[in-house]
């Protein structure tokens, strides 16, 4: 899918707007807000009744190279006794996120936008039962 | 894709850095992948911690809708069907990666932006702060 | 606008059950919380159970034994049923509404309120 | 149950004065999303009780700037830059991090 080009009236293209090949985009990659952080409460994939482990994938043809996956730890969900109960189940939350891939061919490199889809953490979720007629 | 010629080193001195400017092409990898999480799955009505989604959308922003998680409740849904504040539904946050156009409007001129967006929730045992 | 009126027994004997009913307008019971919360006179405010807009409830541990709530969107009504009443649950009874999509989880509207004696 | 203790339990004060109300609770009031639902209602006399300040300072609507709240964990304070006639009342501070949800004893706003 092409980036939607927005209601006619409101893109109209400023003079202000960078000379683009046609088929192509340029793209900045000094990201906006690149030093925030996240404040999520602390240690939840430890705490959670649908517990998760982080790992680091790592491609230096992508931008960013590092992309972290989480990966829920048990298939049902904790109990309030510290055991697993198999009657729930621990799901992943995933999210799209975008990401820049470099291509080699040859002696020239191409550069491609790329939908990536992460798995944030886990939550613990009543299975949906289907019965055998 | 677009192709930029590399050094005349080529092979042997590869960049290992990313340009901060690169051309692409405008048809993205993936894209087709579903991005209305309301119909992705029913997570967020079948968690004990369930999750409410609200749509955040922003013409100037590629893709210009990202659906917003937030907990419905403070407590968790126990095997009762009740609230159960002795456990906490809490967000679970992603720094992501979008477009902005830059400089605003531009049809096809934009810049890396990270947001933070919460994609659903969890239940967590509550870490306990008493006075002393 | 946002309304709340409850309705129930001025006068309930010892050991005898109340029923309330919290009559909503303004608004629907979908998307709102309602919370009930009793003053007995010249007190403070004590916090007794609510209903969520998804059907899920959260009661006081203290009275649990002798509440249940229960709710009708299409009729706009939310039911608090109390047993086993005792002099000292003479109060003024409120129900307040609580709005989903603020999340602050607390009691932005409140009805009038309904007195209750308990006595013989 | 998370106790809210209010001070002082009654105000005595002049139209125009500046009012300080104080409530400390028990426990922490920062729930594990990081939000603290600590709140402030007005009950005046014959009337049911009315939300001033939301999760500790978000002043809900149609209430005068003149009312603010603040703090933080355990301690908070509500503030009356100027004293009118219609904020005399009862105070009573409120939490909803914890079950069962918990309110002070009240603070009387009154005339000197």
């Known amino acids: 899918r092409k980036i939607p080009k927005v209601g006619h009236t409101f893109f109209q293209k400023p003079e202000s707007c960078p000379p683009v090949p046609g088929g192509s985009m340029k793209l900045d990659i000094g990201i906006i807000n690149e030093n925030q952080r996240v404040s999520m409460s602390r240690n939840i994939e430890s705490r959670s009744t649908s517990p998760w482990n982080y790992t680091v994938t790592w491609d230096p043809n992508r931008y960013p190279s590092e992309v972290v996956q989480a990966q829920c730890r048990n298939l049902g969900c904790i109990n309030a006794q510290g055991k697993e109960d198999i009657s729930m189940n621990s799901v992943p939350i995933q999210q799209e996120t975008l990401v820049v891939r470099r291509k080699h061919q040859g002696c020239s490199v191409s550069f491609q936008l790329e939908k990536v889809l992460v798995t944030v953490g886990c939550t613990c979720v009543t299975p949906v039962i289907h019965h055998v007629q | 894709g677009i192709t930029i010629p590399r050094n005349p080193g080529c092979p042997n001195s590869e960049d290992k850095n990313f340009p901060r400017t690169v051309m692409v092409n405008l048809n993205i990898h993936n894209r087709n992948t579903n991005t209305n999480p309301k119909r992705s799955s029913d997570y967020y009505n079948r968690s004990t911690s369930p999750w409410n989604l609200h749509r955040n959308e922003d013409p100037e922003r590629y893709p210009s809708v990202i659906w917003e998680a937030k907990c419905r409740h403070l407590g968790c849904i126990n095997a009762d069907g009740n609230v159960d504040y002795h456990m906490n539904s809490v967000p679970i946050q992603q720094e992501i990666l979008v477009l902005r156009r830059e400089p605003p409007h531009c049809p096809n001129s934009f810049r890396l932006e990270k947001i933070l967006v919460s994609v659903g929730c969890t239940c967590v045992t509550p870490i306990v702060h008493h006075v002393a | 606008q946002v309304q709340l009126k409850e309705s129930g027994p001025d006068l309930v004997a010892p050991s005898q059950s109340l029923s309330i009913t919290c009559t909503v307008s303004g608004f629907s019971l979908t998307s709102y919380g309602i919370h009930w919360v009793r003053q007995p006179p010249g007190k403070g405010l004590e916090w007794l159970v609510v209903?969520?807009?998804?059907?899920?409830?959260t009661y006081n541990s203290a009275l649990k034994s002798r509440l249940s709530i229960s709710k009708d969107n299409s009729k706009s009504q939310v039911f608090l049923k109390m047993n086993s009443l005792q002099t000292d649950d003479t109060a003024m009874y409120y129900c307040?509404?609580?709005?989903?999509?603020?999340?602050?989880?607390?009691?932005?509207?409140w009805g009038q309120g309904t007195s209750v004696t308990v006595s013989s | 149950d998370v106790v809210m203790t209010q001070t002082p339990l009654s105000l005595p004060v002049s139209l125009g004065d500046q009012a300080s109300i104080s409530c400390r609770s028990s426990q922490s009031l920062v729930h594990s999303n990081g939000n603290t639902y600590f709140h402030w209602y007005l009950q005046k006399p014959g009337q049911s009780p009315k939300l001033l300040i939301y999760k500790v300072s978000n002043r809900f609507s149609g209430v005068p700037d003149r009312f603010s709240g603040s703090g933080s964990g355990t301690d908070f304070t509500l503030k009356i830059s100027r004293v009118e006639a219609e904020d005399l009342g009862v105070y009573f501070c409120s939490q909803s991090t914890h079950v069962p949800l918990t309110f002070g004893a009240g603070t009387n706003l009154e005339l000197k």
């Open positions: 209903i969520w807009s998804d059907g899920t409830t």
């Open positions: 307040a509404s609580s709005y989903d999509y603020l999340y602050h989880y607390t009691m932005d509207y």
